[in-house]
């Protein structure tokens, strides 16, 4: 807490201007009017004043808004938003896209803080939805944006949306957003045709089923190794052999080199010996020829 | 936008000195803070010191302390950059500015030349 | 009062990007967020290009930007246009001896 003195004669801040860096920390406490500060706080992201400074300066709003800033001030922070905390920013009520922009600016090159994230949380809950501007703007921020949202949170995103993801955005994704993902991807995405289809929807498959994929094996779609191997295992187990070839295309070959690893390694303890034979890749690990295969999830569900 | 109007070009012999001034019009001259910054030729920029007319003291860069003096008339909005014992390599473009953030006014120039 | 270091020189074809560096200390560019940069043609005054980083003035293109990252700052300079050829240099404020820094100076050559 900066202690209460008078204004030094001739130091009685008029406008926010380049003079007050070198006021001491008193001096800015007793003669920047708060008032002043709340409508020029554009002028103070230009003008290099310490940390210390910007401390003072933002005790000054923290008295004159006790329930928080209102977005005109919000707006203009500048640098002074990388001094407030999440409780300061729980107070507030962002509703533009351009304020919220502004903050994320300031934020820019460096990981998401905490900040941040309780800035978004109170930018997409006072909107009701992740439309997709906003979400525009998150992805191109922190391309991780996306993946950092838990399936509840992601079940608010509308189809729409779904157009401003890039690849990259989902790359930190786990299975169980991929699932919430993947429906709202396919509705956004299903008048396109057969090859723009698969190039949009290639990096949500992760959330894809079986019937998805067996549909797709038959596009002709040549799907690569990365992209098969991000498929979720239960969606894999039940496609044939010559449904994976066809859904790999050239791609194939690329299976001999994944042999050990999840899916291709379970999809593979599911396929006959005989069928895999018929790949020419020397996978091994297939039923025996003259074995019985009994469908025990099958089974179970009759019973 | 403040502008600022800088004195005429000036000749010197080495071991003299030259007062260069700078006159301000629009805003509040007394707050601004007024660099003098100096380009010898083909050099780059040079940062030689500052003032804020109203507070009267000034700062400097270390290279020019003590021979560097740069003070401000708030009656005349003018701000004055004095630099003595000077050398050949002194020669150089010498320009005010009020250049601190958004704020970017610059004068002129003023061609001082050092020359026996 | 050391200088920000600089490339001396840069050069791209119109239509390209550039990107010029500037690296300071953790008492200037890595401890403040702000820098500044300037252009110069030949014979002018300096013209601010960028302000506190990635700000930019009124009535500068937007095809100028600016970025920092630790102890360097940067100026990204997209669709390279003939006019665009200049020297630029890198400027921050020293808190530590309460005055300016700049850089040495950028020539930028537009192929």
């Known amino acids: 807490e900066v202690e209460k003195t008078a204004c030094p004669s001739g130091k009685k801040a008029r406008e926010i201007d380049e003079s007050l860096i070198f006021y001491k920390k008193w001096e800015l406490e007793a003669c920047v009017d708060a008032a002043l500060l709340a409508t020029q706080m554009d002028r103070v992201n230009a003008i290099p004043f310490t940390y210390e400074q910007l401390d003072v300066l933002k005790h000054k709003l923290d008295e004159l808004y006790p329930q928080g800033y209102p977005e005109s001030v919000i707006q203009h922070l500048g640098y002074l938003f990388l001094k407030m905390s999440p409780e300061d920013i729980r107070k507030w009520n962002v509703t533009s896209l351009e304020t919220l922009k502004a903050l994320l600016e300031v934020n820019k090159g460096h990981e998401m803080s905490p900040q941040v994230a309780t800035l978004i949380d109170r930018f997409v809950k006072g909107r009701g939805q992740l439309d997709k501007d906003t979400l525009d703007t998150l992805t191109a921020f922190y391309p991780g944006y996306l993946c950092s949202l838990s399936p509840e949170e992601l079940s608010s995103v509308p189809p729409s949306s779904i157009w401003a993801v890039r690849p990259q955005d989902l790359d930190t994704c786990d299975p169980r957003q991929l699932d919430v993902l993947y429906p709202k991807a396919r509705l956004a995405f299903q008048n396109m045709n057969g090859s723009e289809y698969f190039v949009k929807i290639q990096s949500f498959l992760g959330g894809a089923p079986t019937e998805d994929l067996k549909a797709l094996s038959q596009q002709n779609v040549s799907m690569d190794l990365a992209t098969f191997m991000k498929l979720r295992t239960d969606a894999v187990l039940p496609l044939t052999v010559a449904e994976v070839q066809k859904l790999l295309g050239p791609h194939v070959e690329g299976l001999k080199a994944e042999e050990r690893h999840r899916p291709v390694r379970d999809w593979i303890l599911r396929q006959r010996q005989d069928d895999l034979d018929t790949l020419g890749l020397g996978l091994q690990g297939g039923i025996p020829n003259g074995y019985l295969v009994l469908d025990l999830s099958m089974q179970e569900a009759l019973s | 936008q403040v502008q600022l109007v800088q004195s005429g070009a000036e000749v010197k012999k080495p071991g003299s000195s030259v007062k260069v001034s700078c006159k301000a019009s629009?805003?509040?001259?007394?707050?601004?803070?007024i660099s003098w910054v100096r380009q010898a030729p083909g050099q780059g920029l040079e940062w030689m010191g500052g003032?804020?007319?109203?507070?009267?003291?000034?700062n400097y860069a270390q290279k020019f302390q003590g021979r560097v003096t740069i003070t401000a008339d708030e009656s005349t909005s003018t701000a004055y950059m004095e630099l003595s014992s000077l050398r050949s390599e002194d020669t150089a473009v010498y320009y005010c500015?009020?250049?601190?953030?958004?704020?970017?006014?610059w004068g002129q120039g003023t061609l001082v030349t050092v020359s026996s | 009062d050391i200088a920000l270091t600089q490339p001396a020189s840069v050069s791209g074809s119109p239509g390209q990007s550039i990107t010029i560096s500037c690296t300071g200390t953790?008492?200037?560019?890595?401890?403040?967020?702000?820098v500044s940069w300037y252009q110069q043609h030949p014979g002018k005054a300096p013209k601010l290009m960028i302000y506190?980083?990635?700000n930019r003035p009124s009535g500068v293109s937007n095809r100028f930007s600016g970025s920092k990252s630790g102890n360097t700052a940067s100026l990204t300079i997209s669709g390279l246009q003939a006019e665009d050829e200049a020297d630029y240099y890198c400027?921050?404020?020293?808190?530590?001896?309460?005055?300016?820094?700049f850089g040495g100076g950028t020539k930028l050559t537009v192929l």
């Open positions: 500015a009020r250049t601190i953030g958004i704020y970017d006014s």
């Open positions: 629009g805003g509040t001259f007394s707050s601004y803070y």
């Open positions: 003032i804020i007319p109203k507070f009267g003291t000034a």
């Open positions: 953790s008492s200037d560019v890595g401890g403040y967020n702000y």
């Open positions: 506190s980083v990635n």
């Open positions: 400027s921050t404020y020293d808190h530590t001896s309460s005055g300016f820094v």
